[in-house]
Interface confidence: low
Amino acid sequence: PEPPTACREKQYLINSQCCSLCQPGQKLVSDCTEFTETECLPCGESEFLDTWNRETHCHQHKYCDPNLGLRVQQKGTSETDTICTCEEGWHCTSEACESCVLHRSCSPGFGVKQIATGVSDTICEPCPVGFFSNVSSAFEKCHPWTSCETKDLVVQQAGTNKTDVVCGPQDRLRA
């Protein structure tokens, strides 16, 4: 018969024949032959392979380097890599999370729209009319101006995006 040019799923073509791939968590030791099945071996401690494969070496689990502000979020198995995340107050610089940077703070006049996570930075938004922020913070939202009317007071100084309104007593008519 003609040698196969394509193999079924979870197989690979070698020496004009189809061999079984090794399952996740195992590496290839020797290809199949006309008489023998593919030989696979489990990955060692701190190694993994996450797909059906014909790799002769397992990949090393990622090292979450504390020197780079990293810690283990999820320990690796023979089939999965270690997942790193950043220490509190920091977030990853890339999807691979190879290093961390400090969460951004929102400047006065801006409030936090979305608090940072281990993988995404703080999202800031300008305080709209009627709201203010007078601090640089990675947590504080824009606060609404004080309502002088509800306190039976009048506005003495208008608010800005960085300052609250200043309330004062109403001028009273003398008898």
């Epitope: 990949h59 020197n67 780079l68 502000g69 107050g89 190879e98």
Partner: antibody, heavy 119, light 112 residues
Framework: QVQLVQSGAEVKKPGASVKVSCKAS????????MNWVRQAPGQGLEWMGN????????NYNQKFKGRVTMTTDTSTSTAYMELRSLRSDDTAVYYC????????????WGQGTTVTVSS | DIVMTQTPLSLPVTPGEPASISCRSS???????????LHWYLQKPGQSPQLLIY???NRFFGVPDRFSGSGSGTDFTLKISRVEAEDVGVYYC?????????FGGGTKVEIK
């Protein structure tokens, strides 16, 4: 031992593109980021960016954004750097350099590839 | 971008004598984890750069102990306790704390 072997010298015309390769051996290719650094004649070193071969994520120097593309082929443990719309001031030696994991510095360098841009 | 400024530009040295190169960064290179992401590279004539010192004070494999790095925050120094003829070349400081990573302009060390 760790080795990074780069492709040979290139001569290009302004406006053309160049693709430099860097074949790695002696370590697990997918475990380390690969950087690209260039050096114009008689000048200092300039970092162009890096790529994580495992995920394909890239970090580019804004100066080159839109003109540079970094890729890898994990089956051959090779990193590539393509620079488009070449100008005469792109004439330089281009180096690949591995990023040491715990070092966070470039611990092993290729021999360099000379790219000359001339009409 | 962080600007790295090296002095001197050129340093004529006598074998056996000490030598010192300074590097200043426009921003602090200290991470909250207390590491300083300042490195030193040497480019010998006609060769690729090679790593000498990483993260401020750590000598890379095979680097002789006559090389030492020091400094803090934004001011850094590379010292060679006794210069040897093989130490000639251009020395670069570099930071890897903020993208884009940047290098100093280089200090050319040559024998008097």
């Amino acid at each position: 031992q760790v080795q990074l072997v780069q492709s040979g010298a290139e001569v290009k015309k302004p406006g053309a593109s160049v693709k430099v390769s860097c074949k790695a051996s002696g370590y697990t290719f997918t475990g380390y980021n690969m950087n690209w650094v260039r050096q114009a004649p008689g000048q200092g070193l300039e970092w162009m960016g890096n790529i994580d071969p495992y995920y394909g994520n890239t970090n580019y120097n804004q100066k080159f954004k839109g003109r540079v593309t970094m890729t890898t082929d994990t089956s051959t443990s090779t990193a590539y750097m393509e620079l488009r719309s070449l100008r005469s001031d792109d004439t330089a030696v281009y180096y690949c350099a591995r990023l040491g994991l715990q070092l966070y510095a470039m611990d092993y360098w290729g021999q360099g590839t000379t790219v000359t841009v001339s009409s | 971008d962080i600007v790295m400024t090296q002095t001197p530009l050129s340093l004529p040295v006598t074998p056996g004598e000490p030598a010192s190169i300074s590097c200043r960064s426009s921003q602090s290179l200290v991470h909250s984890n207390a590491n300083t992401y300042l490195h030193w590279y040497l480019q010998k004539p006609g060769q690729s750069p090679q790593l000498l010192i990483y993260k401020l004070t750590n000598r890379f494999f095979g680097v002789p102990d006559r090389f030492s790095g020091s400094g803090s925050g934004t001011d850094f120094t590379l010292k060679i306790s006794r210069v040897e003829a093989e130490d000639v070349g251009v020395y670069y400081c570099s930071q890897s704390i903020h993208v884009p990573w940047t290098f100093g302009g280089g200090t050319k060390v040559e024998i008097k």
